[in-house]
């Protein structure tokens, strides 16, 4: 159904799995757990899908109206520069760190944040609707 | 540019409670993950970890120095404040703070990055 | 608590030599979590501490390749290849773990 989409975009689809939220044409996970930033990928990658890599403000802003104070993964980390699991740059909002040792990235409901790659933390995971190959 | 400064008495006599502050910028101590540690080194001696603060204001301190101890913060300031009461002339040391990143363990942490210049603290009568 | 023992304690060295300081725990420092958090930091005189290692073989921003950490478990070790003036000092390693966070008790670097 979402074959064939590239990294940012999914076509149109009805329905997102169980505990998974429909917003335009991706579904997202939220976690009530928590889980370190390596082990919330591999969470995210066992269901064909991705920890969250935000396209641009839009999306970031409409997602934050689900989250609180609680931090949450984000697919997002520093290796030479900010960038999202899917190769590209972070260039449309700014995080919040300045330290050598945070380099994973995080995001709140007042924006992102660094982290220690080994915090337990909720995180969010994203795919197309019922997509086995269009994972961003 | 992060930036820590210690400032303290000097000299005080023993008994008295030593008062220390730890005045920063480049950073707030209302982000996540950030603390701020102090520290201490007696002349010819080891280098000794004594109390830190998190950005929740999730305390830990020195088991044996304990009941002496007290840390807290004013984070409008972007200061940390640390006493030590009953000193004695082993309580003789420089004294240094610094930031320090959480793991996801509040009673310990890692990477002291940035550090104070220290201040020199000398208990005589 | 962790006692860290550092060997030696005194190191004398010529410039342009290779220095290795051992820094061995009393129990394993493997946090629950996976990683090691020993560390190493360099005190010159009239300076306040400064990170070199962390998380035994990180080089911390700015630190020369010159250092490296190495080691699991309970034996950790830095190297220094060629010494220069600028190194000499004294080396601690730190061990953030397990509570309380500890220090071993220094190793001081100096000229033969």
């Known amino acids: 159904l979402c074959q064939g989409s590239n990294y940012s975009t999914c076509a149109s689809c009805p329905s997102c799995p169980d505990r998974w939220m429909k917003y335009g044409n991706h579904c997202y996970y939220f976690s009530v757990e928590e889980k370190d930033w390596n082990s919330s990928l591999e969470f995210c990658l066992a269901r064909d899908s991705h920890l969250l890599v935000i396209t641009d403000n839009q999306e970031m802003s409409l997602l934050q109206v689900f989250l609180s104070e609680a931090f949450c993964w984000i697919g997002l980390r520093n290796n030479s520069g900010w960038r999202w699991e899917d190769g590209s740059p972070l260039n449309f909002s700014r995080i919040s760190s300045n330290s050598f040792v945070q380099t994973c990235g995080a995001i709140n409901k007042n924006g992102l944040q660094a982290s220690s790659c080994e915090v337990p933390l909720h995180w969010v995971c994203k795919k197309c609707p019922f997509a086995d190959q269009a994972l961003f | 540019q992060v930036i820590l400064k210690e400032s303290g008495p000097g000299i005080l006599q023993p008994s008295q409670t030593l008062s220390l502050t730890c005045s920063f910028s480049?950073?707030?101590?209302?982000?996540?993950?950030?603390?701020i540690g102090w520290i201490r080194h007696p002349s010819g001696k080891a280098l000794e970890w004594l109390a830190h603060?998190?950005?929740?204001?999730?305390?830990s301190y020195n088991s044996a120095l304990k009941s002496r101890l007290t840390i807290s913060k004013d984070t409008s300031k972007n200061q940390v404040f640390l006493r030590l009461a009953n000193v004695a002339t082993a309580d003789t040391a420089t004294y240094y703070c610094?930031?320090?990143?959480?793991?996801?363990?509040?009673?310990?942490?890692?990477?002291?990055?940035?550090w104070g210049q220290g201040t020199s603290v000398t208990v005589s009568s | 608590d962790v006692l860290l023992t550092q060997t030696p304690l005194s190191l004398p060295v010529s410039l342009g030599d290779q220095a290795s300081i051992s820094c061995r725990s009393s129990?394993?420092?493997?946090?629950?979590?996976?990683?090691?958090?020993l560390e190493w930091y360099l005190l010159k005189p009239g300076q306040s501490p400064k990170l070199l290692i962390f998380?035994?073989?990180n080089r911390f921003s700015g630190v020369p390749d010159k250092f490296s950490g190495s080691g699991s478990g309970t034996d950790f070790t830095l190297k220094i290849r060629r010494v220069e003036a600028e190194d000499l000092g004294i080396y601690y390693c730190?061990?953030?773990?397990?509570?309380?966070?500890?220090f071993g008790a220094g190793t001081k670097l100096e000229l033969k």
């Open positions: 610094a930031r320090t990143i959480y793991y996801g363990n509040y009673l310990t942490f890692y990477a002291m990055e940035h």
């Open positions: 480049g950073f707030s101590l209302t982000t996540f993950g950030m603390g």
């Open positions: 603060i998190w950005w929740n204001d999730d305390k």
């Open positions: 129990q394993n420092i493997v946090h629950s979590n996976g990683n090691t958090y």
């Open positions: 998380k035994v073989s």
């Open positions: 730190f061990q953030g773990s397990h509570v309380p966070p500890t």
